[in-house]
Amino acid sequence: HSFGPGPGLGTPRSPCNARGPCRLFFRVCLKPGVSQEATESLCALGAALSTSVPVYTEHPGESAAALPLPDGLVRVPFRDAWPGTFSLVIETWREQLGEHAGGPAWNLLARVVGRRRLAAGGPWARDVQRTGTWELHFSYRARCEPPAVGAACARLCRSRSAPSRCGPGLRPCTPFPDECEAPSVCRPGCSPEHGYCEEPDECRCLEGWTGPLCTVPVSTSSCLNSRVPGPASTGCLLPGPGPCDGNPCANGGSCSETSGSFECACPRGFYGLRCEVSGVTCADGPCFNGGLCVGGEDPDSAYVCHCPPGFQGSNCEKRVDRCSLQPCQNGGLCLDLGHALRCRCRAGFAGPRCEHDLDDCAGRACANGGTCVEGGGSRRCSCALGFGGRDCRERADPCASRPCAHGGRCYAHFSGLVCACAPGYMGVRCEFAVRPDGADAVPAAPRGLRQADPQRFLHHHHHHHH
């Protein structure tokens, strides 16, 4: 299982919110699936809290790529038979530690509620639930404790009296080869898959089954909770889109269907048709990461958290990638330093957001007859012949780059340079070879280079694309 911000919901954060070290606990609560009880009702099927909880420490601005979560399983013992259909409530609680923790020692970070159908003895069922900005990944299964076996844990097994066989009329207990089915206390013939009993000689049916021995699928008219009959009346199936599909109840509220509509049972601190109204007040300290609580003096007025730069969300719980808003103008590079944003500006621009277009030529004309040229978001000096540098103040040696090809000699001149070409060459830079037969002059291949090997070229090209 894992617990952390969902995809696209910001950098995974330590859950401590800069309030010192803390621990996470998970509280699992099971309620009867058919009940219309309010969310705050008792966990009638059982409840348990996770153990072996690691301590997290918060380093401001640091992220935690994955939260090391409480080890091991959360075991919820349930009494009597397993009902098969149930409501699963998982709450994630944070406990603040240390002498300077301040505020309430316990905070409910997230709460997921879902209705589930599960037979005992089956494999692990995997689930992902998102609530607000948090995502909870978990697996669950129902197991019978010996001597109980079966989908409802209603059949009992006893250790074999003899190593080779079970007593007269008793079958081996299939999951436990060393055990035998106990003498039936249920009504004879009661379906072992769909029936169970809590008293001798009774046969109580799991949801979707009926009849004295729980062998008859529930008929169309008696499918419960908006379920519809399956093919060839094999039982009741979950319906198509219903009022509770997608859980319209916000903030961890649980949804129940009522005559074609829905009803939300809201957790403490929330109310409204969809549990969308928060009854939390500023006195509850709902703003994390230095957020300031505004309004919300009483439960009837909603609070708002004003978040410090770099945080967002209704409780300032979500870190923002402020560079994603592209605040740097004119192609500036954005740097989110945590405490502040910085823009590294391209040449020719300045200001905190690179918003100022610098005019490099203003008040600083190019020297020695140079002219100011704009282009590519910056300005530069185009220097007259014989000058160079940023302001054209440096005398340039036009022959420094050895511009005359094929052994031509370079001479500096007030207007630039002149090449005196070696015999057999001509042109401004001695770039043309003169053919002795009087044919046209052709460009000479530069010395030191040869024709590219086509195979090598193709090989390199192929490699480049991998």
């Epitope: 800069a18 309030r19 401001p60 300077h100 923790a101 301040g102 505020g103 309430p104 500023c282 006195a283 509850d284 300290g285 703003c287 994390f288 990461n289 230095g290 957020g291 300031l292 609580c293 505004v294 309004g295 004003h306 410090p308 730069p309 770099g310 605040p327 405490h339 502040a340 944003l341 823009c343 905190p352 957001r353």
Partner: antibody, heavy 118, light 108 residues
């Protein structure tokens, strides 16, 4: 080095509007919330209001109906307007930067004394 | 609003002594969002402590903050001559932001 400088008239007549401007240098005004605080002579500090470049503002309910805080990112300035002033508004007015780990105030201007008198 | 009460109003001590300043809130400050400031005559306040116990940048370690809930303390372990000033606490948990009335630390 971030610096804040308050400016505005030192004397305002009763019932008029007190207007002050704070110029921010050394950092982008978009990086932080910015606030106004005042201190009457010989007394304690009173928070007036704050603003963020996104438009978020908040002010003290005891002054709310009279306070307007605004911000001009292009000039790197934020301003305070306090209407219908009385002698009780005589104070040193400070502009300050709101700390990025919570709404404390980590950098302050040197303050400007405003007297309300006819 | 959260009212902050500072005590004592004035604290007379000698250099080298330990100063303990108290700040009490009228209601719980849920997230330890409390700051301490120092103010010298004719100057703007200076942030010393935020989050009840974290020192601001450049603040000497003789200044320390503690407390949670409604009771907070600023301690100056050994008073230096430059520490004689007024000290204010401020909560930033809930709007409106409020300051305490101040404690003046004077030379005995």
């Amino acid at each position: 080095q971030v610096q804040l400088q308050e400016s505005g008239p030192g004397l305002v007549k009763p019932s008029e509007t007190l207007s002050l401007t704070c110029t921010v240098s050394g950092d982008s005004i978009s990086n932080y919330y910015w606030t106004w605080i005042r201190q009457p002579p010989g007394k304690g500090l009173e928070w007036i209001g704050y603003i963020y470049y996104s438009g978020t503002t908040n002010s003290n309910p005891s002054l709310k109906s009279r306070v307007t805080v605004s911000l001009d990112t292009s000039k790197s300035q934020f301003s305070l307007n306090l209407s219908s002033v009385t002698a009780a508004d005589t104070a040193v007015y400070y502009c300050a930067r709101v700390f990025n780990r919570g709404f404390a105030f980590d950098i302050w201007g040197q303050g400007t004394m405003v007297t309300v008198s006819s | 609003e959260i009212v902050l009460t500072q005590s004592p109003g004035t604290l007379s001590l000698s250099p080298g002594e330990r100063a303990t300043l108290s700040c009490r809130a009228s209601q719980r400050i849920s997230n330890t969002y409390l700051a301490w400031y120092q103010q010298k005559p004719g100057q703007a306040p200076r942030l010393l402590i935020y989050g009840a116990s974290s020192r601001a940048t450049g603040i000497p370690d003789r200044f320390s903050g503690s407390g949670s809930g409604t009771d907070f303390t600023l301690t100056i372990s050994r008073l230096e001559p430059e520490d004689f000033a007024a000290y204010y606490c401020q909560q930033y948990d809930t709007s409106p932001l409020t300051f305490g009335g101040g404690t003046k630390v004077e030379i005995k």
